[in-house]
C-alpha cells in the first residue's frame, strides 16, 4: 500500500481523552503515539474521524472500562461504532457488550471492535458508550482508528 | 497491496509458545499456521517482531488466559503491546485489562489488541502480560502479528 | 490499495443471521451495512467466505453472546475461526474463550478474533461456536469479514 500521490496511504489512530461532557460519544485526541497520515482523514471536534475519499476502510476501536454490577444499571456496558454520512441517517456499524463485573470497587474489561466498511466522501465515524464515566484513559487502554484499503 | 519487488507485501502472524522464563514478555514461534511474508519482518529471539522498512503498520495481538480471582493478585490481567525503536523510549502502544474470573479452578478470557502505528527501520514490537503462567497456548488461542499498509 | 483491474480490492463484511440449524457453524447474510467488494470473495451457503485468489488476507470475526454459568455447561464459550482449503484438512486459525457470566438471566460478552493468513484459491473460512443459541444477533453485535492485503 505504499502509494503514489494519486493514491496516498490514509490512516488514523487517536487516543482517548477524558471529558466533562455528559454525552455518550467518546472524545479523542492527537496525542501520545497517535497516527494521522495526512489531511484525507481528520479528527473533528475531538469526537469523529472524517474521511475525504470514498472507499473501503478497516475501522476499529478499543475501549477499556471499569464497572461494578451493583453500582451500574442492569444493562451491560455497550460500545458502538457508528457512521454519519452526509444526507443519511446515522447507523450502527459494530457493537460489543460486556456485563458488569462483580469485582470491587470496579472490574476492568476491554472491548475490541473492527470491520471493513464502505465510506462516502465526508463520512464520519464515532464511538458511543453507555457510560463514558466508566472508560479507562490510562496509557494505551482506549483508542480508535481506521485505515483505507 | 499486491506489490512489485519495489514494494513487497510485509506481514507476519506468529503463534504463542509456552516458556519457562520468568519474564513478562510473551514468547512466539513460527509454527502451525503462521505467516512470515519475507525477510522484511523477522521474529527475533522468539519474542519480538522486527521490521526493516519505515511505514504504517497495523499491529495486533490476541491473548487468551485462565485466571481465578482468589488465586491471583488484586490487580487485573493486563496485556500490553509495546514498541522498541533504536535510540527511543520503549513505549506502550496498546493495553487491555480484564478482571480475573470467579470460576474455578480458573476462568478463561480472551483479549484482542490492534492499531495502526508508524514504525521506523529496526523497530520491534512485543507483548507483555502481567502473568505469563496464566496464558493459554492451545491451538489458535494466543497469537501476534502485523501487516504493512 | 485502490488497485487496477489486474489487482482489485477484495474485501467482505457479513452480518450474523439467527438459524434454526443445530450446527455449531454460525450463519451469515449480506444484509444491513454489509460489504462484498466483488465476486472474488463470496458468501457460500450463508456460512463461509470463499476466496478465488491466492494471497495474504486479514480475517476477522466478532461474536457477542449471552450466557449464564448455571444454565451452561462447565466449559467456556469458545469461538473459532476455521479454514477449509481444497484437498486439505480443516484447521483452526484462531480461537477465543470466555467463561460464562454469573449474571441472570444471562450476561453478555463480546469476543474479537483477527489475524493475517495465506489463503489458496477456493479456500473458505467460517466461524464455529460452542453454543450458537447463545449468540446475540442485534444490530452490529456479531459479524465476520476479511480483506486481501
Amino acid at each position: 500500500m505504499q502509494k503514489g500521490d494519486q493514491n496516498p496511504q490514509i490512516a488514523a489512530h487517536v487516543i482517548s481523552e477524558a471529558s466533562s461532557k455528559t454525552t455518550s460519544v467518546l472524545q479523542w485526541a492527537e496525542k501520545g503515539y497517535y497516527t494521522m497520515s495526512n489531511n484525507l482523514v481528520t479528527l473533528e471536534n475531538g469526537k469523529q474521524l472524517t474521511v475525504k475519499r470514498q472507499g473501503l476502510y478497516y475501522i476499529y476501536a478499543q475501549v477499556t472500562f471499569c464497572s461494578n454490577r451493583e453500582a451500574s444499571s442492569q444493562a451491560p456496558f455497550i460500545a458502538s461504532l457508528c457512521l454519519k454520512s452526509p444526507g443519511r441517517f446515522e447507523r450502527i456499524l459494530l457493537r460489543a457488550a460486556n456485563t458488569h463485573s462483580s469485582a470491587k470497587p470496579c472490574g476492568q474489561q476491554s472491548i475490541h471492535l473492527g470491520g471493513v466498511f464502505e465510506l462516502q466522501p465526508g463520512a464520519s465515524v464515532f464511538v458511543n458508550v453507555t457510560d463514558p464515566s466508566q472508560v479507562s484513559h490510562g496509557t494505551g487502554f482506549t483508542s480508535f482508528g481506521l485505515l483505507k484499503l | 497491496m499486491q506489490k512489485g519487488d519495489q514494494n513487497p507485501q510485509i506481514a507476519a502472524h506468529v503463534i504463542s509458545e509456552a516458556s519457562s522464563k520468568t519474564t513478562s514478555v510473551l514468547q512466539w514461534a513460527e509454527k502451525g499456521y503462521y505467516t512470515m511474508s519475507n525477510n522484511l519482518v523477522t521474529l527475533e529471539n522468539g519474542k519480538q517482531l522486527t521490521v526493516k522498512r519505515q511505514g504504517l503498520y497495523y499491529i495486533y495481538a490476541q491473548v487468551t488466559f485462565c485466571s481465578n480471582r482468589e488465586a491471583s493478585s488484586q490487580a487485573p490481567f493486563i496485556a500490553s503491546l509495546c514498541l522498541k525503536s533504536p535510540g527511543r523510549f520503549e513505549r506502550i502502544l496498546l493495553r487491555a485489562a480484564n478482571t480475573h474470573s470467579s470460576a474455578k479452578p480458573c476462568g478463561q478470557q480472551s483479549i484482542h489488541l490492534g492499531g495502526v502505528f508508524e514504525l521506523q527501520p529496526g523497530a520491534s514490537v512485543f507483548v507483555n502480560v502481567t502473568d505469563p503462567s496464566q496464558v493459554s497456548h492451545g491451538t489458535g488461542f494466543t497469537s501476534f502479528g502485523l501487516l504493512k499498509l | 490499495m485502490q488497485k487496477g483491474d489486474q489487482n482489485p480490492q477484495i474485501a467482505a463484511h457479513v452480518i450474523s443471521e439467527a438459524s434454526s440449524k443445530t450446527t455449531s457453524v454460525l450463519q451469515w447474510a449480506e444484509k444491513g451495512y454489509y460489504t462484498m467488494s466483488n465476486n472474488l470473495v463470496t458468501l457460500e451457503n450463508g456460512k463461509q467466505l470463499t476466496v478465488k485468489r491466492q494471497g495474504l488476507y486479514y480475517i476477522y470475526a466478532q461474536v457477542t453472546f449471552c450466557s449464564n454459568r448455571e444454565a451452561s455447561s462447565q466449559a467456556p464459550f469458545i469461538a473459532s475461526l476455521c479454514l477449509k482449503s481444497p484437498g486439505r484438512f480443516e484447521r483452526i486459525l484462531l480461537r477465543a474463550a470466555n467463561t460464562h457470566s454469573s449474571a441472570k438471566p444471562c450476561g453478555q460478552q463480546s469476543i474479537h478474533l483477527g489475524g493475517v493468513f495465506e489463503l489458496q484459491p477456493g479456500a473458505s473460512v467460517f466461524v464455529n461456536v460452542t453454543d450458537p443459541s447463545q449468540v446475540s444477533h442485534g444490530t452490529g453485535f456479531t459479524s465476520f469479514g476479511l480483506l486481501k492485503l
Partner: nanobody, 123 residues
Framework: EVQLVESGGGLVQPGGSLRLSCAAS????????MGWFRQAPGKEREFIAV????????LYADSVKGRFTISADNSKNTAYLQMNSLKPEDTAVYYC????????????????WGQGTLVTVSS
C-alpha cells in the same frame, strides 16, 4: 521546552544502590513521558526506563528489569531512578529525557534532555 536537571550520580561498589533524580521545569504540561537512557564510553546511548506522566505506567530495558525502579512525583515535577544490585557494567553517564505530548507516531519527535550524571560501579 522542558529543562531537565539530573542529580544523584556517583561512585558505588558492586551490589550497592543509588537513586537518581530528574527535576523538570518549563513546559511541564507538555510532558507525555519521562525516562532514562545511559551511555557507556564507546557505546551507543541505551534506553533504561520510562514512566508515563498520565498514569504512572512504566517500562524497563531487559538489562535492568528487577533491579531498577522508575517513579515520579508529579507534585515536584521530578522523576526518579532507584538502582539496586548495581554491576560494573552499569557504569555510564545517565541521561534524563522528556517526551512531549503531541509526539505522534508519524514524526520522530525530539526529546528534551538533561546534561547527564555519571554513575561509576567499581570496587
Amino acid at each position: 521546552e522542558v529543562q531537565l536537571v539530573e542529580s544523584g550520580g556517583g561512585l558505588v561498589q558492586p551490589g550497592g544502590s543509588l537513586r537518581l533524580s530528574c527535576a523538570a521545569s518549563g513546559s511541564i504540561s507538555s510532558i507525555h513521558a519521562m525516562g532514562w537512557f545511559r551511555q557507556a564510553p564507546g557505546k551507543e546511548r541505551e534506553f533504561i526506563a520510562v514512566i508515563y506522566w498520565r498514569d504512572g505506567s512504566s517500562l524497563y530495558a531487559d538489562s535492568v528489569k528487577g533491579r531498577f525502579t522508575i517513579s515520579a512525583d508529579n507534585s515536584k515535577n521530578t522523576a526518579y531512578l532507584q538502582m539496586n544490585s548495581l554491576k560494573p557494567e552499569d557504569t555510564a553517564v545517565y541521561y534524563c529525557a522528556a517526551e512531549p505530548y503531541g509526539s505522534g507516531s508519524s514524526l520522530m519527535s525530539e526529546y528534551d534532555w538533561g546534561q547527564g550524571t555519571l554513575v561509576t560501579v567499581s570496587s
